[in-house]
């Protein structure tokens, strides 16, 4: 449906405040430099053309696409070649190739400072003193940090902020009721960033049929009642709805989100049993329950999948007649009766059955050749269920902490090549699979688990596409989407690295460490582990374990002291000595 | 002059438990480590278990989950409880302090030896 001035067809859809909110996203997701003041009057400005727009469509630019709207605003940035160097290259180009310039200059890991927390009582003055302006800030500093962030439901979390503030600055205790609901929606912000960092990675890096396979499995599980024609449908719809958001066309996807809701909610007898109380809520609330919405109960009596997809003599024929649409309902019935698998596991068998028949459908006995291709899903099955079974007892031995620092070790010994913050913080987030996962029953550890690992590895991808100085990482990542895991898993020490020099300075602390939170202080210690095997590749676990111990008493023991900086310095040396002896330096 | 005196080692079964103690004297130990190394028959002496002045402790993998060293740093005593006891712990049993708090699980980081106690472990 052609509509004569595509922003007013989006700023009638979305109304006022949701457009301005969008706009105020993808213009911090694309200049992640630029000062919030800045992007305020962009929006601004922009807003008011759309008005004059929605007033009379035929009005001049008015039947400009989004893309060249939008691209013109942001090329009027005075400052553009000054801050961003090469990107000011992209408002040369006609779109839609200056869209895929701003596309390829999104940065993953932007040089911005860490967002500091207020005071309770600073942030409380700040909002009610202006909430419009406070809750804009909120969505600027989420969206220039996070450039993929899913920006629909980046609303969702700032209307949950708000409310966060509004109910909380008019409490007894502020801090009480304030600072645990920002954890949470900080905590979550992150996670969903980063889930939404692989969906698009799936996209832009392997294509659609990639995503669409994704988004196949993952809904079979989630609504195995539904027919394989509905879950095709919104399959399609979906992944309209995300090679939007990943493509910066923020507006169409809030809109198509929507849509998206509203046919959910308006079909959900044919989709799912549970989705009636996220059909009662309203908008955002509706689309984010939506998302994460349980898997419905499996229908009882469902067949043996052998018969339509191995023993029927019609295998090669269905499979030749329409390869996709045949292996997508092969993906669909296996995926609808196994909620207990991972859904990259899910799409490793579909990859081995569609190799399988690729092969067997030329032989001169197909049938004879693929008749035991079930029996070759077992090896890939239980290897990601041993993997978890050994992790989680690894996990429930060491607890958070020492588990996050064994699979430091595994993975500097792994990649040593890699920065030391980006293991750091990879690590750590891989880490968190144990917390995540491990409390879970049988069946559903393993989706929980491996759909968590990819989501983490993907961080681990982007961030090393951006300075690329691993070649093995560079494998693992392009190689296969859904094989990353099993790629990670299996490399071994790297043989080839060449230690590091030994530097003192980098095992030099001060003070400061002191006042810092236990989060932080715990990731000092595992910025000096990963340096440590940086330096001694080939140190045992047990020596790392007790050199770090030293580490752990040097902390506590100089933040004890009368004079902190003289011990760290005078312990420090001690300390240094004893480390370079115990790993041979 | 510094002198650790063992007490504690004997006979066990397989399964049982010991606790051995160290007395130190003749020096101060507040600010290093103190614990304990092991030698078998024919075998190199090998490190169990040591505390810090803070409190923090670092044990052999071999011993890790069956060991627990404690100390009273009032009383320049190290302790070192051994539960599950099995055939290979079968050693001489030497107390230790450090020269300083890190290092104390190799050799090169102890300044004081005792002379050691005799720990079987019959099957």
């Known amino acids: 449906d052609a509509h004569k001035s595509e922003v007013a067809h989006r700023f009638k859809d979305l109304g006022e405040e949701n457009f301005k909110a969008l706009v105020l996203i993808a213009f911090a997701q694309y200049l992640q430099q630029c000062p919030f003041e800045d992007h305020v009057k962009l929006v601004n400005e922009v807003t008011e053309f759309a008005k004059t727009c929605v007033a009379d469509e035929s009005a001049e630019n008015c039947d400009k696409s989004l893309h060249t709207l939008f691209g013109d605003k942001l090329c009027t940035v005075a400052t553009l070649r000054e801050t961003y160097g090469e990107m000011a290259d992209c408002c040369a180009k006609q779109e839609p190739e200056r869209n895929e310039c701003f596309l390829q200059h999104k940065d993953d890991n932007p040089n911005l400072p860490r967002l500091v927390r207020p005071e309770v009582d600073v942030m409380c003055t700040a909002f009610h003193d202006n909430e419009e302006t406070f809750l804009k800030k909120y969505l600027y500093e989420i969206a220039r940090r996070h450039p993929y962030f899913y920006a629909p439901e980046l609303l969702f979390f700032a209307k949950r902020y708000k409310a966060a503030f509004t109910e909380c600055c008019q409490a007894a205790d502020k801090a009480a009721c304030l600072l645990p609901k920002l954890d949470e929606l900080r905590d979550e912000g992150k996670a969903s960033s980063a889930k939404q960092r692989l969906k698009c990675a799936s996209l832009q890096k392997f294509g659609e049929r990639a995503f669409k396979a994704w988004a196949v499995a993952r809904l079979s599980q989630r609504f195995p009642k539904a027919e394989f024609a509905e879950v095709s449908k919104l399959v399609t719809d979906l992944t309209k709805v995300h090679t939007e958001c990943c493509h910066g066309d923020l507006l169409e996807c809030a809109d198509d989100r929507a849509d998206l809701a509203k046919y959910i909610c308006e079909n959900q007898d044919s989709i799912s049993s549970k989705l009636k109380e996220c059909c009662e809520k309203p908008l955002l609330e509706k689309s984010h329950c939506i998302a994460e919405v349980e898997n419905d109960e499996m229908p009882a009596d469902l067949p043996s999948l052998a018969a339509d997809f191995v023993e029927s003599k019609d295998v090669c024929k269905n499979y030749a007649e329409a390869k996709d649409v045949f292996l997508g309902m092969f993906l669909y019935e296996y995926a609808r009766r196994h909620p207990d698998y991972s859904v990259v596991l899910l799409l490793r068998l579909a990859k081995t059955y569609e190799t399988t028949l690729e092969k067997c459908c030329a032989a001169a006995d197909p049938h004879e050749c693929y008749a035991k291709v079930f029996d070759r899903f077992k090896p890939l099955v239980e290897e990601p269920q041993n993997l978890i079974k050994q992790n989680c007892e690894l996990f429930e031995q060491l607890g958070e902490y020492k588990f996050q620092n064994a699979l430091l070790v595994r993975y500097t010994k792994k990649v040593p090549q890699v920065s030391t913050p980006t293991l750091v913080e990879v690590s750590r987030n891989l880490g968190k699979v144990g917390s995540k996962c491990c409390k879970h029953p049988e069946a559903k550890r393993m989706p929980c688990a491996e759909d968590y690992l990819s989501v983490v590895l993907n961080q681990l991808c982007v961030l090393h596409e951006k300075t690329p100085v691993s070649d093995r990482v560079t494998k693992c990542c392009t190689e296969s989407l859904v094989n990353r895991r099993p790629c990670f898993s299996a490399l071994e020490v790297d043989e080839t690295y060449v230690p590091k020099e030994f530097n003192a300075e980098t095992f030099t602390f001060h003070a400061d460490i002191c006042t810092l939170s236990e989060k932080e202080r715990q990731i000092k210690k595992q910025t000096a582990l990963v340096e440590l095997v940086k330096h001694k590749p080939k140190a045992t676990k047990e020596q790392l374990k007790a050199v770090m111990d030293d580490f752990a008493a040097f902390v506590e023991k100089c933040c004890k002291a009368d004079d902190k900086e003289t011990c760290f310095a005078e312990e420090g040396k001690k300390l240094v000595a004893a480390s370079q002896a115990a790993l041979g330096l | 002059h510094v002198q650790l005196v063992e007490s504690g080692g004997g006979l066990a079964q397989a399964g049982g438990s010991l606790r051995l103690s160290c007395a130190a004297s003749g020096g101060t130990f507040s600010n290093s480590c103190m614990g304990w190394f092991r030698q078998a028959p024919g075998m190199e002496r090998e490190f169990v278990a040591i505390i810090r002045s803070t409190g923090h402790t670092t044990y052999a993998d071999s011993v890790e989950g069956r060991f627990t060293v404690s100390r009273d740093i009032a009383k320049n005593t190290v302790y070192l409880e051994m539960n599950s006891l099995k055939p290979e712990d079968t050693a001489v049993y030497s107390c230790?302090?450090?020269?300083?708090?890190?290092?104390?699980?190799?050799?090169?980081?102890?300044?004081?030896w005792g002379q050691g106690t005799q720990v079987t472990v019959s099957s």
């Open positions: 230790v302090a450090g020269v300083s708090d890190y290092g104390c699980y190799r050799t090169s980081g102890i300044k004081y």
